[in-house]
């Protein structure tokens, strides 16, 4: 079996981002996203 080892040589930082749902759609409340390495992934 192949073994995968992640060793990129640099640290990837992540940051929680918050958006207002009413400003990006039609719902109320807040949307929580996660930015990893400059890309919003969730």
């Amino acid at each position: 079996d192949a073994e995968f080892r992640h060793d990129s040589g640099y640290e990837v930082h992540h940051q929680k981002l918050v958006f207002f749902a009413e400003d990006v759609g039609s719902n109320k409340g807040a949307i929580i996203g996660l930015m990893v390495g400059g890309v919003v992934i969730a």
């Epitope: 940051q15 981002l17 918050v18 958006f19 009413e22 400003d23 109320k28 409340g29 807040a30 996203g33």
Partner: nanobody, 124 residues
């Protein structure tokens, strides 16, 4: 020219209250999320709270949730930050900021315009 002018800061004892105001001019107020950040000496700028362009949604940092309340008056282009049960760790310069609606609300880089700040000191 866009201007954000904060007022209402001062010295207050622990457990006390303050109400900060931010008056905006030179922008279409109803298109902007309004936020408050704070910065203590030697520390990074910290998100405090934000309110949506319509005023229908607010969001607070965990550190102030349940103690601070943010509101806005779109007729007067003004936002208000009611701060209750203040603690010494709330001591900082408080800055009002405006971000075009739709951008992330809890990061300073989203905010196009900033006020000069008002100092809040919580001490006995």
């Amino acid at each position: 020219e866009v201007q954000l002018v904060e007022s209402g800061g001062g010295l207050v004892q622990p457990g006390g209250s303050l109400r900060l105001s931010c008056a905006a001019s030179g922008l279409t107020f109803t298109l902007y999320t309004m936020g408050w950040f704070r910065q203590a000496p030697g520390k990074e700028r910290e998100f405090v709270a934000a309110i949506s362009a319509s005023g229908g949604t607010t969001y607070y940092a965990d550190s102030v949730k349940g103690r601070f309340a943010l509101s806005r008056d779109n007729a007067k282009n003004t936002v208000f930050l009611q701060m209750n049960t203040l603690k010494p760790e709330d001591t900082a310069e408080y800055l009002c900021a405006a971000a075009f609606r739709g951008f992330a609300i809890n990061t300073p880089t989203s905010y196009n315009y900033w006020g000069q700040g008002t100092q809040v000191t919580v001490s006995s």
